[in-house]
């Protein structure tokens, strides 16, 4: 239960008052307001929306609301020289061209400034050559092609289907394979759920729909020209050749109507197995090149996008804490969209807006939170998490000393089946306790708690009677806070049924069809799922900012550390002979985990018993909880990824969206059997075990009695 004794308020100002103030109708109204025109990062429209949000947050009652601007590298198509892909005949004549843009959704025919589909940060170029179909362009797909099928992608244009992994990883893999261009497409197998109509009559992707997105491999760097430092007025910028994470080959996305035209002519090798076949009426031949009759035809890309340093604007709102104003709980989500942003991000931004309004209402009635709450509307998330990262770089010294928690608030929905939560283990108990107090919005669970419907629909694979909570990966604005700065972080949204809907993300993701109507007609007509997400996100912020003792349970970290240690040990034990030969031992890691478990247990006992009326002791215990996440940060970062500094979690090197545990050890072990120098490779495994063991032990000691 929340505790409000220290905040000079009447009894009615508790969590219930905050939650009761949240209204579905307001979220609906805000979503409509935020989605009528595009709000692409770096555009005047998005600047105007930033100023509107600043003004409204002030009206809602926040103490201060400021714009924080940065000049970062963005990418746009050339307005007079459009991007497209051709099939050319032996004379070089273009016999087929892909669409230049998506057919407009009904009601939006006269909207200007809809950016055509493009892969942000693609270099310019007009490569031509034979096509190779590379499935999802995952690491394992290229292994299959190169090692098993002996197909060489060098000098080829590859075509990959969207899904499974972050598109930037696909491009990186294609580059490493020697490809000279990448075509990304949405296959109906991944973006068209059976039995559902395509937009505007359902939530499926039409054949002309295309997913936009950046193709960077930033590894947490933020603005490619100013890694590690804010892109402010006096910034030193790298030359474009030294910029972080930019792709080196042209890349362009297409829809499945156009993909059909490219794939139907494919010849060469047959697909290796059924997992390489999508749902188009094409053979899914791998290539290289077109079949017999069309063997003289080639594919040509025409990419003319430009990278430009452009001003972006974050909105930062402050609600000052009454007791611990120097402790920050942050709620942040982005504002920029690819087009209308009906789901991504405005379903999240509308929820943040209503949460701010509710907090503001309480504040106007005389209430203040115990700790300071910061609200953020980030810019340029779609271009590589730039707004949040630049702000965190600018404020890193404050954040590492004062940051209690970060709650992310991008899309509130990606389905309407059940809750989905990814967070630090420190927040598991907070999430469990909160969802037990909230009503489920799900049909068939009337009068039941959110915890109950969530657990039933998405059970934990390890613990019966508990819901699944996933690891944090990346691909969203929590990245800099968690992976770089070590601030406890979490995210929550409503999701689809992963059992029955195996498509990737939601079908209309990053397309022009992500409109207000998509949400209002097909996902959440009553906005009850949005309201539930507002209650979860807002409730977490309320509790983190207001409870006397921080609602973190360090024992949950102990449990997962043991699980992760077991998992990485199992992976290593696939090579028993090498472990013996190179004297690889995990004893130090298991010992550190054991110590952590014991110390965490004792700390939790002390937490129950200490004198909470003693402000010094209270602050001391809370600081130990706050700084525990920070203790998992290695200042040197992970190998070749200096901005991923968390030793327990990092985005997977093969899929930015996914979280990997003990990533240093995992990466050292990955594909180790193919390393040319096994002695060196196993030496790195041993070094990574040492780093992990040391870090876990060091973190444990931060929980020991201070004297």
């Amino acid at each position: 239960k929340s505790s409000n004794e220290a905040t000079n308020i009447t009894p009615k100002h508790n969590m219930k008052a905050f939650l009761d103030e949240l209204k579905a109708e307001n979220i609906k109204k805000f979503l409509y307001n935020f989605t009528q025109i595009p709000h692409l990062a770096g555009t005047e429209q998005n600047f105007q929306l930033a100023k509107q949000i600043q003004s409204q947050w002030k009206e809602f009652g926040l103490d201060s609301v400021e714009l924080a601007h940065y000049d970062v590298l963005l990418s746009y198509p050339n307005k007079t020289h459009p991007n497209y892909i051709s099939i050319i005949n032996e004379d070089g004549n273009e016999i087929f061209n892909t669409s230049l843009f998506e057919p407009p959704p009904p009601g939006y025919e006269n909207v200007s400034d809809i950016v055509p589909p493009f892969s942000a940060f693609s270099p310019q170029g007009m490569p031509e050559g034979d096509l190779v179909y590379v499935n999802y362009a995952r690491t394992e797909d290229f292994f299959k092609l190169e090692r098993d099928m002996k197909i060489n992608c060098s000098g080829k244009i590859v075509i990959a289907r969207y899904g499974k992994v972050f598109r930037g990883n696909k491009v990186k893999n294609a580059q490493l394979a020697g490809a000279k261009g990448v075509i990304l497409y949405s296959d109906p197998a991944d973006y068209f759920a059976p039995g559902v109509k395509s937009y505007p009559d359902g939530w499926n992707l039409p054949g002309g729909g295309v997913q936009r997105g950046n193709i960077l491999n930033l590894n947490g760097a933020g603005d490619p020209l100013t890694p590690g430092y804010p892109a402010n007025e006096y910034a030193y910028r790298r030359g474009i050749a030294e910029a972080v994470g930019l792709p080196s080959i042209p890349v362009h996305p297409i829809g499945y109507y156009d993909a059909q035209k490219l794939l139907e002519k494919m010849g060469g090798s047959a697909p290796p197995d059924s997992s390489w076949r999508g749902s188009l009426k094409v053979p899914y031949n791998v290539g290289p090149g077109f079949t017999g009759n069309f063997s003289t035809q080639k594919v040509k890309m025409h990419i003319h996008s430009t990278n430009e340093v452009t001003r972006i604007y974050n909105v930062i709102g402050t609600l000052r804490g009454a007791v611990e104003p120097d402790r920050y709980v942050i709620l942040g989500g982005h504002r920029d969209s690819w087009v209308f942003g009906g789901i991504d991000p405005q379903s999240g931004a509308a929820v943040v807006h209503e949460i701010v309004r509710s907090f503001g209402t309480l504040k106007k009635e005389g209430w203040r939170p115990r700790r300071t709450i910061l609200f953020a509307s980030w810019d340029a998330e779609e271009f590589g998490l730039l707004g949040s990262t630049e702000w965190a770089e600018e404020n890193s010294r404050l954040l590492q000393e004062r940051g209690v928690a970060y709650i992310n608030a991008d899309s509130s929905i990606e389905g309407n089946y059940t809750l989905r939560v990814d967070c630090t283990p420190l927040m598991y108990s907070l999430v469990h306790n909160l969802t037990k107090e909230l009503k489920s919005p799900d049909e068939g669970f009337e009068g039941k708690s959110l915890y109950e419907s969530w657990t039933k629909k998405s059970p934990s694979p390890e613990f019966s009677g508990m819901p699944r909570i996933s690891k944090l990966g990346s691909g969203n604005d929590f990245e800099v806070f968690f992976q770089r700065l070590g601030i406890a972080s979490g995210r929550a949204r409503y999701t689809k049924n992963w059992e029955t809907n195996k498509f990737s993300g939601y079908p209309l993701y990053h397309s022009v069809y992500e409109t207000y109507e998509l949400v209002e007609k097909f996902y959440d007509p009553m906005f009850k799922y949005h309201l539930t997400v507002a209650q979860v996100r807002g409730g977490m912020v309320f509790e983190l900012a207001n409870s006397i003792v921080l609602p973190f349970d360090c024992r949950d970290y102990a449990v997962v550390l043991r699980k992760y240690a077991d998992k990485i040990y199992s992976i290593s034990m696939k090579h028993p002979q090498e472990m013996k030969t190179y004297s690889v031992s995990f004893d130090s890691l298991f010992s550190a985990v054991k110590n952590f478990t014991e110390i965490a247990s004792k700390f939790s006992e002390r937490l129950q018993d200490f004198d909470k009326s003693n402000p010094i002791v209270l602050r001391m215990m809370n600081d130990q909880l706050m700084f525990l996440e920070r203790a998992f940060i290695d200042p040197l970062g992970l190998p070749d990824r200096p901005f991923y500094r968390h030793v327990i979690y990092a985005p997977s090197s093969h899929n930015k969206y996914a979280g990997e545990s003990f990533p240093g050890i995992y990466d050292a072990l990955f594909d180790i059997e193919s390393k040319v120098d096994p002695s060196k490779a196993w030496g790195e495994v041993k070094r990574q075990i040492y780093v992990a063991a040391f870090t876990v032990q060091a973190a444990a000691e931060t929980l020991s009695e201070v004297a």
Partner: antibody
Framework: EVQLVESGGGLVQPGGSLRLSCAAS????????MAWVRQAPGKGLEWVAS????????YYLDSLKSRFTISRDNAKNSLYLQMNSLRAEDTAVYYC????????????WGQGTLVTVSS | DIQMTQSPSSLSASVGDRVTITCRAS??????LAWYQQKPGKSPQLLVY???TLADGVPSRFSGSGSGTQFTLTISSLQPEDFATYYC?????????FGGGTKVEIK
């Protein structure tokens, strides 16, 4: 065999109303978007309105939106066009047509029904 | 709204002639274009969709081509039953407008 049969046309005075019907057979009616397309005497084709599979979304030529209403009854395999405040310039053969989605061509056409607006 | 401009508005040709009708869109409609044939007193019939795909049962002497803003319908060898009026129509956005028509008459 696909059949679309329009009815309800005739002579009507300016300012009057008329309700056109279209009876469909030979295909799964609810799998198709339906539309009305008109052709004034000696002139070209002009799209009037469309309705989606279940009738939840309707689309109109802007200039006709306030006067015409398209509807459907999937249980009866029928399409309708309610025309109010008719004007002389609404005189035309009105065709019922079917397409298999919002972004699709008109695959099926009826034989048309003539509406004459005259005093 | 996207306007469709057909040319010529009429043409005279003989049986066996190659006939080409063009259609220009006021905006880029990719290949979201259909061609219809209408004979006097009859309803229109679909000939071509997606700019180049022949509808079921349409003779192979008909062909469509083009993309973006410029489209053509070609009849490789005009037959007596082909004398009719031909319309192009885009289905890129609402409203889905038709061209003004091309009347193919016997020379």
């Amino acid at each position: 065999e696909v059949q679309l049969v329009e009815s309800g046309g005739g002579l009507v005075q300016p300012g009057g109303s008329l309700r056109l019907s279209c009876a469909a057979s030979g295909f799964t009616f609810s799998d198709y978007y339906m539309a009305w397309v008109r052709q004034a005497p000696g002139k070209g084709l002009e799209w009037v309105a469309s309705i989606n599979y279940d009738g939840s979304s309707t689309y109109y030529l802007d200039s006709l939106k306030s006067r015409f209403t398209i509807s459907r009854d999937n249980a009866k395999n029928s399409l309708y066009l309610q025309m109010n405040s008719l004007r002389a310039e609404d005189t035309a053969v009105y065709y019922c047509a079917g397409s298999d989605g919002y972004w699709a061509w008109f695959a099926y056409w009826g034989q048309g029904t003539l509406v004459t607006v005259s005093s | 709204d996207i306007q469709m401009t057909q040319s010529p508005s009429s043409l005279s040709a003989s049986v066996g002639d190659r006939v080409t009708i063009t259609c220009r869109a006021s905006g880029n409609i990719h290949n979201y274009l259909a061609w219809y044939q209408q004979k006097p007193g009859k309803s229109p019939q679909l000939l071509v969709y997606n700019a180049e795909t022949l509808a079921d049962g349409v003779p192979s002497r008909f062909s469509g081509s083009g993309s973006g803003t410029q489209f053509t319908l070609t009849i490789s060898s005009l037959q007596p039953e082909d004398f009719a009026t031909y319309y192009c129509q885009h289905f890129w956005s609402t409203p889905p407008t038709f061209g003004g028509g091309t009347k193919v008459e016997i020379k």
